[in-house]
Interface confidence: low
């Protein structure tokens, strides 16, 4: 807001008064104001803003005041050459008050010549009858931005869904730089992935690491000189490996004697990715098995030829256990009965053209 | 059981460019972190830098400028070329692999092979 | 960078004694710490990682604990062939750092 006094009594502890009446410029200044007709004191339509030097491009200071008889700058408490000024004025159709504007331009090698702790600055000082008021400080900055960031973001390598901080400090500057977060050479919007968070103090926050997060970091600082970039921090999210679940024993890879059966599992669940660990353990369980061997059936030798029976045939047989088979093994091929004709015995054969029936003895 | 092999000149003149290859056996060189880490007589361990598989590196800053980490995932191989050495770069270099986890700890080891700057 | 510095840089001790070798990061790394044995003229030997988890095939005499900034490597009863250097080396950020190592001899 405006601050008003009246007659040079001071707001400011900016030693005021400080241009001293040899000064030729404040010899234009009134020495006495008219009471008569009475009139409010100056009041600032606009106000001079601070002000930044770009390279060697000089600023304007610019303010308006209403009523004014004069307007003047001051700068570091030193009144500004009545020349230096660039004033226009008008009365106001409506209140019928004086509207003065004044504008004055400041180079760089004006702010660079000042000498002291305190930054250059300027301010209004407004006359009406009433008395003075004088503007808010301006304040009138030669910007610059470092080339060096003063924290650097690192890379880093992170498993999923992780919370990733990197930091950057950016460069020292005038005015400060305002701070950007690249993925790679696109801006990061945290408004519209809600991932990412940018901190006060310009660090970057991926709050649940996701595979698509592996990507060059950059931070952008940037003021009205320039814009600088950090070095690119590589962030790896990576997946370290599971296993999946076992599959069903094998068949016992012996058909006959002492084997093993297998079972095996892969590291795909997930497999590791982007330099996650490998799983730990076994891929294969092996584990003794043993299988009966099969045996096939052999025939035992002939019996003897039974007697000769009634029916004029006598027989013989084998067994299939020698051995019998076991353990799946082949059955024995072949009869185990066989008979034939036979004539002698109890053998009962018909006479020829005859009833009877002779009977051989053996 | 993952074995790492450096080899290259034992003697580099200064300001030469120092060249070592590590040759990787026993297991694939994708999805781990591969180091260079050296040790001058008597001292302790530097990182050096490492490469990924997908060919992210990293470098110390400290020798970042003079410093190339380069892989052939072809040939199981990863190398390291160190450009203007001076006396101060007279060490045994180790390859080394970075386990992927967080902490990336360096499980697997070369036996490392000493390398003297001298004329 | 982040300087990981060991203490003490070396100690004496007799069979079954029990060891402990602390490690401070200059910042906060977590838990993103491992440990390493080197006997004289062969590589680093991965001991534990994770600053806590014990490598397969390491013996269980050997344990790691902490978590930020302080970290301690504990030997519960010193073996022979537990004469070495040991070496802590953090993964929180690049570059990688090891600490200066601790150089356990025989009393």
């Known amino acids: 807001g405006s601050h008003h006094h009246h007659h040079h009594g001071s707001d400011y502890k900016d030693d005021d008064d400080k241009g001293s009446q040899d000064d030729e410029f404040f010899h234009e200044l009134p020495e006495t104001f008219p009471s008569d007709p009475p009139e409010p004191l100056p009041h600032f339509l606009i106000e001079p803003e601070e002000a930044y030097i770009v390279k060697n491009k000089p600023v304007n200071l610019y303010c308006k005041a209403s009523p004014a008889t004069q307007i003047y700058f001051k700068c570091n408490s030193e009144w500004v050459h009545q020349k230096d000024h660039v004033v226009d004025e008008r009365v106001d159709e409506t209140s019928g008050l004086i509207v003065r504007e004044v504008s004055i331009e400041i180079s760089r090698q004006q702010v660079e010549e000042l000498f002291g702790p305190e930054d250059y600055w300027c301010q209004c000082v407004a006359w009406s009858s009433a008395g003075t008021t004088k503007s808010r400080k301006a304040y009138v900055r030669i910007a610059y931005l470092r080339k060096t960031f003063e924290q650097e973001p690192l890379g880093k390598e992170v498993s999923l869904e992780q919370e990733v901080l990197l930091q950057c400090r950016p460069p020292e500057g005038i005015p400060v730089a305002e701070v950007e977060w690249l993925k790679n050479e696109d801006i990061i919007d945290p408004a519209e992935d809600r991932n990412f968070y940018i901190t006060i103090d310009h660090n970057l926050i991926i709050k649940q690491a996701r595979l698509s997060d592996t990507a060059n970091y950059t931070c952008v600082a940037k003021n009205i000189v320039a814009k600088r970039k950090s070095t690119t921090a590589t962030v790896i999210v990576y997946v370290n490996g599971g296993w999946s679940t076992w599959t069903e024993w094998s068949v016992c890879n012996s058909r006959c004697g002492r084997g093993y059966q297998k079972r095996t599992r892969t590291c795909t669940n997930p497999a590791p990715l982007n330099g996650g660990a490998f799983c730990e353990g076994q891929s294969v369980q092996k584990i003794a098995c043993t299988t009966l061997c099969p045996v096939d059936g052999r025939w035992t030798s002939w019996s003897k030829w039974s007697t000769c029976g009634t029916e004029c045939t006598h027989w013989r047989r084998r067994e299939c256990t020698a051995p019998a088979p076991k353990n799946g093994g082949k059955d024995c091929d072949g009869l185990v009965l066989q008979s034939k004709n036979c004539t002698d015995g109890l053998c009962m054969q018909a006479a020829p053209d005859s009833d009877d029936v002779a009977l051989y003895g053996s | 059981q993952v074995q790492l092999q450096e080899s290259g000149p034992g003697l580099v003149k200064p300001s030469e460019t120092l060249s070592l290859t590590c040759t990787v056996s026993?297991?694939?060189?994708?999805?781990?972190?591969w180091s260079w880490i050296r040790q001058p007589p008597g001292k302790g361990l530097e990182w050096i830098g490492y490469?990924?598989?997908?060919?992210?590196?990293n470098y110390n800053p400290s020798l970042k400028s003079r410093v190339t980490i380069s892989i052939d995932t072809s040939k199981n191989q990863f190398s390291l070329k160190l450009s203007s050495v001076t006396a101060a770069d007279t060490a045994v270099y180790y390859c080394?692999?970075?386990?992927?986890?967080?902490?990336?700890?360096?499980?697997?080891w070369g036996q490392g092979t000493l390398v003297t700057v001298s004329s | 960078d982040i300087q990981m510095t060991q203490s003490p840089s070396s100690l004496s001790a007799s069979v079954g004694d029990r060891v402990t070798i602390t490690c401070r990061a200059s910042q906060s790394i977590s838990s993103y710490l491992n440990w390493y044995q080197q006997k004289p003229g062969k590589a680093p030997k991965l001991l534990i990682y994770a600053a806590s988890s014990l490598q397969s095939g390491v013996p269980s005499r050997f344990s790691g604990s902490g978590s930020g900034t302080d970290f301690t490597l504990t030997i519960s009863s010193l073996q022979p062939e537990d004469f070495a250097t040991y070496y802590c080396q953090q993964s929180y950020s690049t570059p990688l750092t090891f600490g200066g190592g601790t150089k356990v001899e025989i009393k």
């Open positions: 026993g297991g694939s060189i994708s999805s781990y972190f």
């Open positions: 080394a692999r970075g386990r992927g986890m967080a902490t990336l700890p360096f499980d697997y």
């Open positions: 490469i990924h598989n997908s060919g992210t590196t």
